[in-house]
Amino acid sequence: AFGISGVQKYTRALHDSSITGISPITEYLASLSTYNDQSITFALEDESYEIYVEDLKKDEKKDKVLLSYYESQHPSNESGDGVDGKMLMVTLSPTKDFWLHANNKEHSVELHKCEKPLPDQAFFVLHNMHSNCVSFECKTDPGVFIGVKDNHLALIKVDSSENLCTENILFKLSET
């Protein structure tokens, strides 16, 4: 559904979108897994949290993440199609006071302790480009998505519409 530079074009105004209201429109706990059903897990090591992508043993419990969904308003003068649009933004918190952050300099995904209001690096634009899977695009860096690299979460630049469906940026949410 994009031209050659579609991803850059359709995300160009993400920087300017404003989150309507401070409170999320909905929140719920879910486990996060990859397209290939590996689990995203969080471990406390040396007073900081590490994020892993791994196969769980048969009866091992999946880590849960609190997903908070926010509505982001896109004024028509920015949206490029003459109509006010809304996006879903999400923050992900695996444990109290810690949130996933995009570290754009290091192309990494990190867990940071912080207070509200959360910084823009903690917000991700929600996409469901694939049946029953979601992707998380950095609010601070349009065209860059949370993805899986070497059994860790990393930031992955998506430079064409075909790559929007690449398996390493697709995730499944499950409340069970």
Epitope: F2, Y10, G82, V83, S131, L164
Partner: antibody
């Protein structure tokens, strides 16, 4: 403003292929998913499938073997083809646009007026 | 597929009445539920999305509640233009299934 308009033949013969087009204006197919939904006379709504903003397509598994959704970006059109139709496919066919950019979680905010397709010889 | 069961299938009410329609999902759908209003010969109109959010231009007498598997659409004071059929729809997983509809008729 946002508009969706379905068009296509109102009468299709059994075993033939039903072809409909949804022409959209006031928004970009690169930002919003467009869905096809149908409603048999006097009955409820059935979701057929979606062309998502990224160009991927999802279908209702009950119809998957017979349905094809495609797009023509240059014409701002989304097409629906349903093969091997029977009288049970007689319905009003709607196209509808997602409420949210990039995501279907918010339901369908804008609908076409619908077009009645009758399957009969 | 996720089954959506609406109740009642029809109801008779008077102008000014408080009307409640329920929708039950066969598995959890978080809050990814929409409600639509459809009048005869017209397209459905989005009333509520994300279970509780009022769509643009929808009167505040409409409200939605619920999460998980149990959801409710409430019309606080029924108006003449509210006589229609109402559908719930889950948007948690494809196929995005609808309830069978609730027809609200004049008593």
């Amino acid at each position: 403003q946002v508009q969706l308009q379905e068009s296509g033949p109102g009468l299709v013969k059994p075993s033939e292929t039903l072809s409909l087009t949804c022409t959209v204006s006031g928004f970009s197919l690169s930002k919003y998913g467009v869905h096809w939904i149908r409603q048999p006379p006097g009955k409820g709504l059935e979701w057929i499938g979606v062309l998502r903003a990224g160009g991927t397509i999802s279908y209702n598994s009950a119809l998957m073997s017979r349905v094809t959704i495609s797009e023509d970006i240059s014409k701002s059109q989304v097409s629906l083809k349903l093969s091997s139709v029977t009288a049970a496919d007689t319905a009003v066919y709607y196209c509808a646009r997602d409420h949210y950019y990039y995501s279907s979680f918010g339901g369908f905010a804008s609908w076409g007026q619908g077009t009645l397709v009758t399957v009969s010889s | 597929d996720i089954q959506m069961t609406q109740s009642p299938s029809s109801l008779s009410a008077s102008v000014g009445d408080r009307v409640t329609i329920t929708c039950l999902a066969s598995q959890t759908i978080a809050t990814w539920l929409a409600w639509y209003q459809q009048k005869p010969g017209k397209s459905p109109k989005l009333l509520i999305y994300a279970a509780t959010r009022l769509a643009d231009g929808v009167p505040s007498r409409f409200s939605g509640s619920g999460s998980g598997t149990d959801f409710t659409l409430t019309i606080s004071s029924l108006q003449p233009e509210d006589f229609a059929t109402y559908y719930c729809q889950q948007l948690y997983n494809t196929p995005y299934t609808f309830g069978q509809g609730t027809k609200v008729e004049i008593k």
